[in-house]
Amino acid sequence: LRPSRVHNSEENTMRALTLKDILNGTFSYKTFFPNWISGQEYLHQSADNNIVLYNIETGQSYTILSNRTMKSVNASNYGLSPDRQFVYLESDYSKLWRYSYTATYYIYDLSNGEFVRGNELPRPIQYLCWSPVGSKLAYVYQNNIYLKQRPGDPPFQITFNGRENKIFNGIPDWVYEEEMLPTKYALWWSPNGKFLAYAEFNDKDIPVIAYSYYGDEQYPRTINIPYPKAGAKNPVVRIFIIDTTYPAYVGPQEVPVPAMIASSDYYFSWLTWVTDERVCLQWLKRVQNVSVLSICDFREDWQTWDCPKTQEHIEESRTGWAGGFFVSRPVFSYDAISYYKIFSDKDGYKHIHYIKDTVENAIQITSGKWEAINIFRVTQDSLFYSSNEFEEYPGRRNIYRISIGSYPPSKKCVTCHLRKERCQYYTASFSDYAKYYALVCYGPGIPISTLHDGRTDQEIKILEENKELENALKNIQLPKEEIKKLEVDEITLWYKMILPPQFDRSKKYPLLIQVYGGPCSQSVRSVFAVNWISYLASKEGMVIALVDGRGTAFQGDKLLYAVYRKLGVYEVEDQITAVRKFIEMGFIDEKRIAIWGWSYGGYVSSLALASGTGLFKCGIAVAPVSSWEYYASVYTERFMGLPTKDDNLEHYKNSTVMARAEYFRNVDYLLIHGTADDNVHFQNSAQIAKALVNAQVDFQAMWYSDQNHGLSGLSTNHLYTHMTHFLKQCFSLSD
């Protein structure tokens, strides 16, 4: 007979997270981003799939499209025309790459409650959008662009040279979609819909990556993608603009490329309309340390676009590449010539600058040993932006308002003190003229979305507070999280540590390092997540750490550009340094340390395992890069230069995982990759495996047939179950 144990009743009902919880998405959260249609109105899809219009000022709501209409064509998405006469309904969604997909589109006429018949849209369409005013339609079908003046009208074909895998009009090719724009579209309406600008990408000379897609046919299909790897031939881009009122009159007019850009290989990086007759294009040299912003004007007399040299603004980096991950985009002010833009100041921190005539005469708007991250909106009297200034935590995001109408400009943090414990990482979405805005808080507490008055910043209402999630978590023993920093040799290493619920500093715990570590990334963020590593801490008693080392973002150029032309060195060193510091803290079992990462993180975890330090017992690489010669030109060359003898070939060769095959002998290595990875090709893992076999080094591997870089669907469950078994075995944890 055993005496009944006395428990704290609350403790007794608490349970640890299970792997099933994670795989089922039991503790996922919701955000609320209004689909703004005016200064005071927005659309939102209700829980029962009606499309509802909300008027903030009156507090009234209206169903503009019933779930019955949505269901009649199996619509999964919608778009209201700006004149509110039509809605496009999107169905048969078929994913292509990261952003791109094809779909079938139906146009519903709100004035008669019927679908538009006659001159229906072809299928499947690659991209479709309304003009910003009225109800003109632009769409891309079979790599060509079409225009409709009204939904029921016959289409006007703008381009004729579109060809699969050869010429792309109005949509990007693979590398522009993933690494440059990064969007599924490459066409842009002018503010009132007078003109339509578009990009043409010529991929005729780009080498093709080919891989098998096994499907369930007798013979596998071969997927072919024009994909420029480092040093290979790149797409050739041209920008055209057409008058949409009289499209046949002069046809598409090409926008000239700045001479200093056109002299060698180059990229187009973005297009921003300023007015209906002024457009701003950004260009980038293939060696991505020089960017040119070019402001072009419509010449009525010639019906052409003129880009005077006096309206060219050069942005150059002498210590790294231009910009952060991408070159920032300008936000124009009401005078339609001056603009605000984020770039490095003289101290090497990314800040907002105001450019009126030349970049040299730019007026710095923000400054400090922190970074401005995004400009959300510029109005007549205010500029709204996000930064990580508050309390000097680089992994936070707060929204600020600078008054630009008064002198000196005054700065106010809109979000810093709203829900201080719960919310330290915000983004925002503004209505026309910033009359109202939504704040979306991602953590560290449970995410919450709120609506605010754009003049007073007063909270109007809660849009989504994740009450169900809050209730569901009440009986869950979540791990503890802490964000702190290590100071090592004049480098600040911020880290996030996820600790078991009953963490005791006097005990020893196995340590798992989760790493990404790619240039201009950030892993240590004050955001809410209940994910696989939460489960590993909660149920399996592991300590998990994430470390932002050299090459990571939002802490100044010194840290960011430290990895320039030298990928695979300092990122790895800094993970190792952090692990040594964690061991010194006294609660880590130094015989049970593992590292894992995905994509760039798989590259870093592989190199860390092969570093010869003896620190790591085991590790996992999911879809890793193994040699920079195998990855996309746009991304790789930004950070590494070219793989040529007279440039940086030597480091391309030195930084491969294969070169370190011998060093995997004393670690347990699990290598995982999807065979249909269009991004980091299976080739990367195939070459690691070959090198390990040739070196007679034992390792474990798992491939996922026909899965891409995301390893989604059923593969996700298998993947995390498999990795869990591997880690538990490595750490001698019972199943």
Epitope: E41, E57, S111
Partner: nanobody
């Protein structure tokens, strides 16, 4: 140019009914979207119901199932049948017109207005 004239307002008990009418002048009445707005003291003018040129109706969720908008093109008239009235329905009711879509809920988007008719619902 469209001229609008409302009628039919008055005092009614809670749960009672009223029918508002709006007579429009202008030959192209049929091509206009028509709307009924209301304004209670100290509050914004709000769209209660709208009807498109094609006869498609939309309602504020607060009145859906109680109010019905309709139009008689031959008589250039638009109606608002209000049933199960509540004290909070008390307001000045305005008839409005615009060319184009009916799914505009802000007064600034409706260029043509009547003078308004008072509806008072007593408890």
């Amino acid at each position: 140019q469209v001229q609008l004239q409302e009628s039919g307002g008055g005092l009614v008990q809670a749960e009672g009914s009223l029918r508002l009418s709006c007579a429009a002048s202008g030959r192209t009445f049929g091509s206009y979207a028509m709307g009924w707005f209301r304004q209670a003291p100290g509050k914004e003018r709000e769209l209660v119901a709208g009807i498109s040129s094609g006869g498609i109706t939309n309602y504020a969720h607060s009145v859906k199932g109680r109010f019905t908008i309709s139009r008689d093109i031959d008589k250039n008239t638009v109606f608002l049948q209000m049933n199960s009235l509540k004290p909070e329905d008390t307001a000045v009711y305005y008839c409005a017109a615009r060319s184009g879509g009916a799914y505009y809920t802000s007064r600034v988007d409706w260029p043509y207005w009547g003078q308004g008719t008072q509806v008072t619902v007593s408890s």
